[in-house]
Amino acid sequence: NQDLPVIKCVLINHKNNDSSVGKSSSYPMVSESPEDLGCALRPQSSGTVYEAAAVEVDVSASITLQVLVDAPGNISCLWVFKHSSLNCQPHFDLQNRGVVSMVILKMTETQAGEYLLFIQSEATNYTILFTVSIRNTLLYTLRRPYFRKMENQDALVCISESVPEPIVEWVLCDSQGESCKEESPAVVKKEEKVLHELFGTDIRCCARNELGRECTRLFTIDLNQTPQTTLPQLFLKVGEPLWIRCKAVHVNHGFGLTWELENKALEEGNYFEMSTYSTNRTMIRILFAFVSSVARNDTGYYTCSSSKHPSQSALVTIVEKGFINATNSSEDYEIDQYEEFCFSVRFKAYPQIRCTWTFSRKSFPCEQKGLDNGYSISKFCNHKHQPGEYIFHAENDDAQFTKMFTLNIRRKPQVLAEASASQASCFSDGYPLPSWTWKKCSDKSPNCTEEITEGVWNRKANRKVFGQWVSSSTLNMSEAIKGFLVKCCAYNSLGTSCETILLNSPGPFPFIQDNIS
């Protein structure tokens, strides 16, 4: 084959910052680094046809298909998509390579297909083919991992039946409480499905794919720890596997562990024991209770007993369907402008929820923390003292839950004014909602003390902006006040603000702000 230009085809994926649509080269986006698409000469094709690897992108994604041509001289080009010709403007980069780009903003089904780029250089003509399709994420799933015992081995296998196949990792911690947070140095991660070291304090298995990350903790009763004030509770759905680990440490090997369900010993095949010596020569024993697929009659108090430790129990509750228990009544809060405050929702749920906090159509990440009493709590503190409606939404595989909050920020009114030929209006967003007075400024009343009561129309909370109430007051023009300056004042328990308007002009004049407190 004759000497051909060196062709490089790349994909640039953009993180959308806004909702602009259309093909453009100046776009308000943050770009990821270019990804090589392995452009290669298609064998046995008529003419010189380069083909890039097929590209599969998410719906609404924004991408750039780009070709870099290392060929001498100028190039001209033409894009063809679905038999339509599209404008093509090559430019040259710092390495003097010809650069041709096709920007696809907010990918839709209609923009999927074959993009052909015809390039003419001084030496030769060639075609570059890109195939762009929309990824079918409807088939994607991410399921919470569960445990199985490895055949003929004292080890646990972590399984997550998800699409695409997830990366499975064990998250291990040998400390207590706060120091077992995900990014703590005490936490060790092992990217494998099988775990042999089952003696640790805190053992979790996590699965992650394009949809996110789901984790399951190995439920543990530690006989050396002081029991919780409330009995630990474990929820499972019918058919799910049950795993409870009982752990005990003693100065020597002279002790044993047993499991009972409602005072009856567990059947053989529903438990297995492991033991090891720790660094200080004490003996650690663990005894697993497991049921490969639970039924309703597996509900009850599971008690782990030791010949050398006080026994401890856990309540296992088998449910037909998942649930989210919390009070969904809406809550209103009134706080000062600099007061520290967090919204919080306390709930009990199984399976674990996914949740979001929403304000002004913006979603915020939602963190949840387990409490000792079997409840969980989610707090939201990032409101930046913006008044309005805040929504907590939670869901799991079987249930949904929404709770509304209203946040009011106590502050002195601030007044905005506008005037038309027939009326003057003032607006204020202070809280508590202000009351209004209108005053006329004249020779008789240079300090604007003459109150106007005729033609005033107050509308409390006429505009609800994402839950933020705005109060307004309108003064209808009459001959008695035409040509005069009038002053509208909004006042509440925190102070007063006023705005002065000249009534024969179409706009406010001048914006004299009298901050009378």
Partner: antibody
């Protein structure tokens, strides 16, 4: 620019499990229909293809080694992991990962970029 | 499973000469899906040719590939000092992917 880099233990004992990681950059399996393969080369011998994984998570394995191999990717981290169970001294080789710019059952099933390789010795 | 046989095992030539390397397959290869790689000592293989005859990016035109069915050839028209290395053919298009045993091209 496209790069691939293999990492893993240099010495493994017989019967143990070997885990190798290939970290790649300059391309991704998240958007483009491509794949990454593991290929090995015993000292002084020929190349032997072991396993392949493509962006749509399709996997294929060498017939002789299928029962001992697993392959997985983490597209977010641009990594691919190969595990080989029950290793034997005959598994001593330089292990390469290489990019395939398309699917293995198409005209794009060759390897256009290779890592520099990592030598794994299996010995007690 | 297709078996790839490369011959000769070793080829001794001088710079400037023409090298012809052969690759035979035990069955017909779909659509001539054959690739050739060069491996210099202590380095990873490098793609030279794909689709039997298409040169990869940056490969000099002294390298050419030909063939069909079960017989494929890599030709180096004028050997340069840096061309002395081991060459492998590979078939693709279906699993398993297989490589030939290699031809060592050495300086005479």
């Amino acid at each position: 620019q496209v790069t691939l880099k293999e990492s893993g233990p240099t010495l493994v004992k017989p019967t143990e499990t070997l885990t190798l990681t290939c970290t790649f950059s300059g391309f991704s399996l998240r958007y483009a229909r491509m794949g990454v393969s593991w290929i090995r080369q015993p000292p002084g011998k020929a190349l032997e293809w072991l396993a392949h994984i493509s962006s749509n998570d399709e996997k294929s394995f060498s017939t002789a080694l299928e029962s001992r191999l697993t392959i997985s990717t983490d597209t977010s981290k641009s990594q691919m992991v190969l595990t080989m169970t029950n290793v034997d001294p005959v598994d001593t080789a330089t292990y390469y990962c290489a990019r395939m710019p398309g699917d293995s059952n198409t005209w794009r099933g060759f390897f256009d970029y290779w890592g520099q390789g990592t030598l794994v010795t299996v010995s007690s | 499973e297709i078996v790839m046989t490369q011959s000769p095992g070793t080829l001794s030539l001088s710079p400037g000469e023409r090298a012809t390397l052969s690759c035979r397959t035990s069955q017909t290869v779909t659509n001539s899906y054959i690739a050739w790689y060069q491996q210099r000592p202590g380095q990873a293989p490098r793609l030279l040719i794909y689709g039997t005859s298409t040169r990869a990016t940056g490969i000099p035109d002294r390298f050419s590939g030909s063939g069909s069915g079960t017989d494929f050839t890599l030709t180096i028209s004028r050997l340069e000092p840096e061309d002395f290395a081991v060459y492998y053919c590979q078939k693709y298009g279906s699993s398993p992917l297989t490589f030939g045993g290699g031809t060592k091209l050495e300086i005479k």
